[in-house]
């Protein structure tokens, strides 16, 4: 049982990219407000987004404390203007979220090619090491800091005049590939966590091509 004239939240969904994590739910409130609570399996509940009319709550600050923990959230519904009101069981109406383990489930954000440099028939392609909101010792960690060797990048590269995409892979943020002299190449990268079964791959980075500003060419 729950409070009179309130509707329980439903379709509770975690939306998370590079650990920026938001809980979303329905319905849009009519004469009601919501409060969210989050906890680890073994921890205490912590309240967030008090008495909000939003249907989302940013829980990043909580989950980044330990991205390998499994979290559960719940959304409480209260009558607008009467948030102390409870049902006959003495507890407001609420709905539980699915469990969420950030390390295993956060989506990988679209990567960016930071630079590429050609030296003769070799090209060094560097992927930007994106900063996350995960902190250690008061500094924000990069995606590589968090995932280590669990994170790899796949580079797709092709001659501007051709359609076939060659691939290279790295568990750092740099590729060193062989290219044909005098040919212009284009590049795109994808972040991958091979050990996952879901949310394994990011979307592709924007394509960068030689002859554009980002690159540098040196004849050796």
């Amino acid at each position: 049982s729950g409070t009179t004239n309130t509707v329980a939240a439903y379709n509770l969904t975690w939306k998370s990219t590079n650990f920026k994590t938001i809980l979303e739910w329905e319905p849009k409130p009519v004469n009601q407000v919501y409060t969210v609570q989050i906890s680890t399996k073994s921890g205490d509940w912590k309240s967030k987004c008090f008495y909000t009319t939003d249907t989302e709550c940013d829980l990043t600050d909580e989950i980044v404390k330990d991205v390998k923990q499994t979290y559960l959230a719940r959304v409480f519904s209260y009558p607008a203007g009467n948030v102390e009101s409870t049902g006959s069981a003495g507890e407001p109406l609420y709905e539980n979220s699915p469990e969420f383990t950030p390390y295993l489930e956060t989506n990988l954000g679209q990567p960016t090619i930071q630079s590429f440099e050609q030296v003769g028939t070799k090209v060094n392609v560097t992927v930007e090491d994106e900063r996350t909101l995960v902190r250690r010792n008061n500094t924000f960690l990069s995606l590589r800091d968090v995932f280590g060797k669990d994170l790899i990048y796949t580079l797709y590269y092709w001659k501007s005049s051709s359609s076939g995409k060659k691939t290279a892979k790295t568990n750092t943020n740099e590729f060193l590939i062989d290219v044909d002299k005098g040919e212009n190449y284009c590049f795109s990268v994808q972040a991958v966590i091979p050990s996952r079964t879901v949310n394994r791959k990011s979307t592709d980075s924007p394509v960068e091509c030689m002859g554009q500003e980002k690159g540098e060419f040196r004849e050796i």
């Epitope: 790899i152 796949t154 797709y156 359609s163 076939g164 995409k165 060659k166 691939t167 290279a168 892979k169 790295t170 568990n171 590939i177 062989d178 795109s188 994808q190 991958v192 091979p194 079964t197 879901v198 394994r200 791959k201 592709d204």
Partner: antibody, heavy 120, light 107 residues
């Protein structure tokens, strides 16, 4: 359970066409790379080409370039190998295989294979 | 393309023997080498990945190692079910290439 099942093989005349299918179950193909590998009777393994179903990117062995096309239908969780202008030397068992996209790029699951015979 | 030169092309051995198969890459492939086992009429099966890592479910008598561009598959004590053909494969760069295969036969 992860499974790849090839179909569509058979006897075809030189110059003819054939389309092979690779139906995946137990995983989503758009999260992986799918390769085609062939093996002529009594011979070794020869890589044919790959597709990344998440973006449609492909690459082919020189021996099939311009004649073979790999595609994927993510709604059917199936990859395809369209083979045109077939030659006697294309006679082989054709396998599809899953690449988990690790740094070493190993193929962790293979289909059972489908035999393509090109003969007049 | 990177060539993978595998040797020997065939060998005869007895149950309990230690068997070694080698593959030499024509250029640096880092550790991006896998080994597969294939039995007649069957698809290849992954044994070793990243040059030296045993794939899940593969018996511990199989092992892999790397020295520069030379890669070795070792079967420490050959079992009856190990008589098969073995292939190395590099996937350091596209196109991935296979060795010619080594057929392990009963002596």
């Amino acid at each position: 359970e992860v499974q790849l099942v090839e179909s569509g093989g058979g006897l075809v005349q030189p110059g003819g066409s054939l389309r092979l299918s690779c139906a995946a179950s137990g995983f989503t193909i758009s999260h992986y790379i799918i390769h085609w590998v062939r093996q002529a009777p009594g011979k070794g393994l020869e890589w044919v080409g790959y597709i990344d179903p998440s973006n449609g990117y492909t690459y082919y062995a020189d021996s099939v370039k311009g004649r073979f096309t790999i595609s994927a239908d993510t709604s059917k969780n199936t990859a395809y190998l369209q083979m045109n202008s077939l030659r006697a030397e294309d006679t082989a068992v054709y396998y599809c295989a899953r690449d988990i996209q690790s740094v070493s790029g190993e193929f962790d699951y293979w289909g059972q294979g489908t035999l393509v015979t090109v003969s007049s | 393309d990177i060539q993978m030169t595998q040797s020997p092309s065939s060998l005869s051995a007895s149950v309990g023997d230690r068997v070694t198969i080698t593959c030499r890459a024509s250029q640096d492939v880092n550790t991006a080498v896998a080994w597969y086992q294939q039995k007649p009429g069957k698809a290849p099966k992954l044994l070793i990945y990243s040059a030296s890592f045993l794939y899940s479910g593969v018996p511990s008598r199989f092992s892999g190692s790397r020295s520069g561009t030379d890669f070795t598959l070792t079967i420490s004590s050959l079992q009856p079910e190990d008589f098969a053909t073995y292939y190395c494969q590099q996937h350091y760069t596209t196109p991935p290439t296979f060795g010619q295969g080594t057929k392990v036969e009963i002596k």
